[in-house]
C-alpha cells in the first residue's frame, strides 16, 4: 500500500493565529481607548486611579528587546484573565452610574474573551505551557460607593489600555521570531 492519505489543512496555523491575536489586540485597544475617553467625559477623573487587585504592568519599553514567546504569551494571558474578571465585576457591581456604559462594557468583555481564546489556541498549537494563574484569585467585593465604582472603572480601563499597548508591541516583535 502507498502512503496514507494526508489531512486537509485546518483553518489557521500558529503564524496566522499570531496575526489574528495582533488584530484582536489592536481592536480591543481601540475599544478600550474609546471607552476610557467616554468615562472621562461622563465622570472626570481627579488624577490617576489604582486598584490593588489589578495586575502590575508586565513590560516596559526597555524590556521589549529581550522578550521570549512563552513568557509574553503566558503573562499576557494571565493578565487579560484578570482584566476579564474585573470587567465582569464592573458590569455586575458597578451600580447605576455605570449602567449607561453597559453595552460598551459588554462588547469589551466579549472581545476580551475572544482574544483570550485566540491566545490559548496559539499556545496550544505551539505547545507552550499554559499554567493556571499563580496568584490566588482575590475576591472582588462590592465598591464602597458610587464614586468608588467610577474610580475602579477608571483604574481598570487605564490598566487594560497600558497592558494592551505593550501587548501589541510585544506580539509584533514575536512575529519575527516564529
Amino acid at each position: 500500500p502507498g502512503p496514507p492519505a494526508g489531512s486537509p489543512r485546518v483553518s489557521s496555523d500558529p503564524r496566522a493565529d499570531l496575526d489574528s491575536a495582533v488584530l484582536l489586540t489592536r481592536s480591543l485597544l481601540a475599544d478600550t481607548r474609546q471607552l476610557a475617553a467616554q468615562m472621562r467625559d461622563k465622570f472626570p477623573a481627579d488624577g490617576d486611579h489604582s486598584l490593588d487587585s489589578l495586575p502590575t504592568l508586565a513590560m516596559s519599553a526597555g524590556t521589549l528587546g529581550s522578550l521570549q514567546l512563552p513568557g509574553v504569551l503566558t503573562r499576557l494571558r494571565v493578565d487579560l484573565m484578570s482584566y476579564l474578571r474585573h470587567v465582569q465585576w464592573l458590569r455586575r457591581a458597578g451600580g447605576p452610574s455605570l449602567k449607561t456604559l453597559e453595552p460598551e462594557l459588554g462588547a469589551l468583555q466579549a472581545r476580551l474573551e475572544r482574544l483570550l481564546r485566540r491566545l490559548q489556541l496559539l499556545m496550544s498549537r505551539l505547545a507552550l505551557p499554559q499554567a493556571a494563574p499563580d496568584q490566588p484569585v482575590i475576591p472582588l467585593g462590592p465598591p464602597a460607593s458610587a464614586w468608588g465604582s467610577i474610580r475602579a472603572a477608571h483604574a481598570i480601563l487605564g490598566g487594560l489600555h497600558l497592558t494592551l499597548d505593550w501587548a501589541v508591541r510585544g506580539l509584533l516583535l514575536l512575529k519575527t521570531r516564529l
Partner: antibody, heavy 114, light 111 residues
Framework: EVQLLESGGGLVQPGGSLRLSCAAS????????MHWVRQAPGKGLEWVAV????????YYADSVKGRFTISRDNSKNTLYLQMNSLRAEDTAVYYC???????WGQGTLVTVSS | QSVLTQPPSASGTPGQRVTISCSGS?????????VHWYQQLPGTAPKLLIY???ERPSGVPDRFSGSKSGTSASLAISGLRSEDEADYYC???????????FGGGTKLTVL
Amino acid sequence: EVQLLESGGGLVQPGGSLRLSCAASGFTFSSYGMHWVRQAPGKGLEWVAVISYDGSYKYYADSVKGRFTISRDNSKNTLYLQMNSLRAEDTAVYYCAAGVPDYWGQGTLVTVSS
Amino acid sequence: QSVLTQPPSASGTPGQRVTISCSGSSSNIGSYYDVHWYQQLPGTAPKLLIYSNEERPSGVPDRFSGSKSGTSASLAISGLRSEDEADYYCAAWDPSLYGPVFGGGTKLTVL
C-alpha cells in the same frame, strides 16, 4: 496536504526499548508543538507526551514519566519517541499529532509481550 | 478513569439531531481552557472536528457544531447520516499535566 507518517513500531519484550519516528510534511513543522497520543486495543485515546515548537518544553503523562523521551529535529521535520523499560500496558497504537492536535498520523502499533 | 466524562454511547436515526456531552471541572474546561472534539471512524486515526469550543476546521460540514458552558461542553450533530457512525472524543488542556486530557469517548450508532 499535511502528512504525518509514523514508523518504528513492532513487537518487543517487557523491559525492552523501541524508538518511534514521525516524518512530517505539508506544513511548517517548526511552528507546531508535537504530541504522541496512544490508543490501547479497544480503548480510548491517552495523551503520552508533548514537545514545544522549538523543543524547549517537554511534558509527559505520569504513566510514562522517566521511561519515555520525546524529541524533535526541525531540520529534518521529524519527531521521535524513545521508549525504554516497556511494559505490557504500553501496548497500543501510537499516533504522532501536531498542534492542538490539529493533524494526526495513521499510527504505528507497539506490542509489548513475551 | 478519564478527567473529562463522556457518555459511553449515543444513538440516533438518519436525519435526527444528537448531542454528546463532555463534563470537566473548574481546573480544565471551567478555567477558560477551550474544548476540542475529534471523530474517529472505525479503523482510522482521529480527525479534528471542532476546535476552540465552536470553530470548525475547513472541510468539516456545518452539521457539526460545538458549544461550551461552565465546566461542560457539547457536540451536536444535526441531520445524522450513516457515515457519522464513529467514536467521538472531547479534549481540553489540563494545567496540572501541561498537556491535553481526553474524554473516554462516545460511540455513536446510527440506527
